[in-house]
């Protein structure tokens, strides 16, 4: 027969197998055994139940010192097999054994789920000596039990290298359901199904799950834990939670917000960091991402000019860093710039447009009709050219840069001259005789140096060789000019 003592008068399934008894309690002793003064066990259990065969480990002692009779086998007395109690209650249980006095130094150890309990546990062993035997009661107490105290407890005793093991005492700590898996916040596509999971455990089991959406119950009848809720889709943000119910009451999970992915908000604070003649460096502050990571951004550039055709240039860039260098712009031009970014749902609106300007550019064409003369009497070279047809964007002409390279017998040196914008001729001193002088000219504005003209070569003979024929820039498509002597 299996005995039960319980907290509440309600049916509870008996535990099969090796559990000899069951007790559900939250308080006080059930019965007293003999005890030493000053020690009152808080919870004691029924001693041996007659008529039940014992299947645990026993030690069978050999012959006594008198050499006449065998001692009976040693075994722990039977005790309650199952204790059910609520979380945070105190519990005390024990095992007892009678040991013939011929044995010395008997020690009892407590084990839980196969591991010895050492250290800070409240275990007390009491000895009650008699003429022939000593009754030993080992008590184990736990204050304010927790779920982690659930398990199978046994006593072990070593005698003469033999190990005696008690029946297990199964402690079941019951409480409110405990979540092992709660729903997680998610960002989902509008009208697209997704799953939420909720799992909770007892004891006591079963644990039943209700789902709640925006304070309304989704399922009017519970599902057994674990539960997966397939949400058919949402059109607006919702908050979900799950309720876990068991016989002890209910526990509510955290509420999780399910957001609906949307297009991002437009970027803000588009600002100019640096302008050159042909590029503008901008940055922006990204808008709200719409619950979906940014993928990339688009920089839109319109030329602000009544004469322009109003076309928009689009430059695609990565979403991070929030910065982009717009290139291939015209010099000294005004532009309107906006930024839009996209996520998996789509493109944001364009940011507020900002105005930006490029600076003066360098000339885009070289001076024309470059001619070179050798003035032997003055030992210099005369250079003449025509002013290039520069565009307005290149800005004001500030002068010219003349490159002249002198080459003779393995020696080469380049010299640069700067001349003012009003000139269209220059003279340079002959640097080396019996050498070739190669001349190129570039126009200069505040925006920089333009391209150099095609090279014009003139041969500088040794003293006394005179040739007044000029070298000049060839017509387009001709080979490099050379001075024919």
């Amino acid at each position: 027969a299996i005995t039960e003592a319980r907290e509440e008068a309600k049916p509870y399934p008996l535990f099969p197998g090796p559990l000899p008894g069951s007790l559900q309690t939250d308080h006080t002793s059930l019965l007293s055994l003999p005890h030493t003064s000053g020690y009152q066990p808080a919870l004691m259990f029924s001693p041996t139940q007659p008529g039940r065969p014992y299947t645990g480990n026993v030690a069978i002692p050999r012959v006594t010192s008198a050499g006449s009779k065998l001692l009976p086998p040693l075994a722990f007395k039977h005790t309650v097999g199952h204790i059910i109690l609520s979380e945070h209650k105190d519990v005390k249980f024990n095992c007892s054994i009678s040991v013939p006095n011929i044995y010395q130094d008997t020690t009892i150890s407590w084990w839980k789920d196969g591991k010895e309990l050492l250290g800070a546990h409240h275990a007390i062993t009491q000895f009650y000596p008699d003429d022939e035997v000593t009754a030993i009661i080992a008590s184990f107490s736990i204050t304010s039990v927790q779920r982690s105290d659930n398990g199978s407890y046994i006593c072990k005793m070593k005698i003469n290298n033999e190990e005696i093991v008690s029946d297990p005492i199964y402690i079941e700590v019951q409480g409110l359901p405990h979540f092992t898996k709660q729903p997680e916040s998610m960002n989902v596509t509008r009208n697209t199904a997704f799953n939420l999971t909720c799992q909770a455990v007892g004891p006591p089991e079963p644990v039943n799950i209700f789902w709640v959406q925006n304070s309304s119950r989704v399922n009017e009848q519970p599902e057994k834990s674990p539960s997966v809720l397939t949400v058919p889709g949402l059109t607006e943000m919702a908050v979900f939670s799950c309720e876990a119910h068991n016989d002890k009451g209910l526990t509510v999970s955290k509420g999780v917000q399910i957001n609906i992915k949307a297009i991002p908000s437009p970027p803000t604070e588009v600002s100019i960091h640096n302008s050159t003649a042909h590029s503008i460096l901008i940055s922006w502050v990204p808008g709200f991402d719409g619950y979906s990571p940014f993928r990339n951004c688009s920089v839109q550039v319109k030329e602000v000019d009544p004469l322009s055709n109003g076309s928009v240039m689009i430059f695609n860039t990565s979403a991070s860093p929030h910065m982009y260098q717009i290139k291939q712009l015209q010099a000294l031009a005004n532009y309107s710039i906006g930024v839009s970014c996209m996520n998996e749902i789509g493109w944001s609106a364009v940011s507020p447009w900002i105005l930006a300007s490029t600076t003066e550019g360098a000339p885009s064409v070289a001076p024309l009709n470059v001619t070179v003369f050798l003035n032997e009497s003055r030992d210099n070279v005369d250079i003449r050219w025509m002013k290039p047809l520069t565009k307005r964007q290149a800005g004001e002409l500030v002068g010219y840069r003349i490159s002249h390279v002198w080459q003779s017998a393995g020696i080469s040196k380049e010299l640069l001259e700067e001349v003012g914008q009003n000139n269209s001729r220059a003279q340079i001193s002959v640097q080396v005789h019996n050498a070739t002088c190669t001349v190129r000219i570039a126009a200069v504005t505040k925006g920089g140096v333009g391209p150099f003209s095609d090279p014009v070569k003139i041969f500088i003979p040794a003293h006394g060789w005179v040739d007044h024929a000029p070298s000049s820039t060839p017509a387009p498509g001709n080979a490099d000019p050379v001075l024919i002597i």
């Epitope: 009208n191 789902w211 959406q213 925006n214 309304s216 989704v218 399922n219 009017e220 009848q221 519970p222 599902e223 809720l229 058919p232 889709g233 059109t235 919702a238």
Partner: antibody, heavy 118, light 106 residues
Framework: QIQLVQSGPELKKPGETVKISCKAS????????MSWVHQAPGKGLKWLGW????????TYADDFRGRFAFSLDTSVSTASLEINNLQNEDTATYFC???????????WGQGTLVTVST | QIVLSQSPAILSASPGEKVTMTCRAT?????MHWYQRKPGSSPKPWIY???NLASGVPARFSGSGSGTSYSLTISRVEAEDAATYYC?????????FGGGTKLEIK
């Protein structure tokens, strides 16, 4: 497949009692609530209430408290609706409907016409 | 309780036409369901949770809406669509149905 089969039509006199049954098959009966809906001639659908097939607890809409009673026989997967003290205005077709998540009536019985007439 | 108003009460359309019927709630609801009922048969589940077509429902049907305003649209009406369509809310008890929109085919 899932089916809800209702009992046949009933002709009753005012003051009498009628009991309509709804036998479910093809799913675990105690996993889903059972709602009752009626439609009076020329009118729309109206929800009477539902019964929790797991706990047996009924819930009634305000207009159907008192004379209406839901019950279960889980051993034969059957829900029943009993109407006491029948009145002429109880004449309607009564439907049982399995209630899924989000109060979606995914499966309906074929309907039982109750006629109350002197 | 949440009251659902369906409009129009009667909708007449020719085959091939696009039609839309609406269902308005007196307060915000989480989902709207739709059912089709033809004379002499029980209501058929038609659109679940605002926009999900029930099994066997033709793809020309669609549902949309949020908050207090929902609609059922048929992109190209066919003769077999003649029926009364009821909306039903999920959010709070009691469950309530709209008064129905009767679709007639010319």
């Amino acid at each position: 497949q899932i089916q809800l089969v209702q009992s046949g039509p009933e002709l009753k006199k005012p003051g009498e009692t009628v009991k309509i049954s709804c036998k479910a098959s093809g799913y675990t009966f105690t996993s889903y609530g059972m709602s009752w809906v009626h439609q009076a001639p020329g009118k729309g659908l109206k929800w009477l209430g539902w019964i929790n097939t797991y706990s047996g607890v009924p819930t009634y809409a305000d207009d159907f408290r008192g004379r209406f009673a839901f019950s279960l026989d889980t051993s034969v997967s059957t829900a029943s609706l009993e109407i006491n003290n029948l009145q002429n205005e109880d004449t309607a077709t009564y439907f049982c409907a399995r209630e899924d998540n989000w109060a979606w009536f995914a499966y309906w019985g074929q309907g039982t016409l109750v006629t109350v007439s002197t | 309780q949440i009251v659902l108003s369906q409009s129009p009460a009667i909708l007449s359309a020719s085959p091939g036409e696009k039609v839309t019927m609406t269902c308005r709630a007196t307060s915000s609801v989480g989902y709207m369901h739709w059912y089709q009922r033809k004379p002499g048969s029980s209501p058929k589940p038609w659109i679940y949770a605002t926009s999900n077509l029930a099994s066997g429902v033709p793809a020309r049907f669609s549902g949309s809406g949020s908050g207090t305003s929902y609609s059922l649209t048929i992109s190209r009406v066919e003769a077999e669509d003649a029926a009364t369509y009821y909306c039903q809310q999920w959010s709070s008890n009691p469950r309530t149905f709209g008064g129905g929109t009767k679709l007639e085919i010319k």
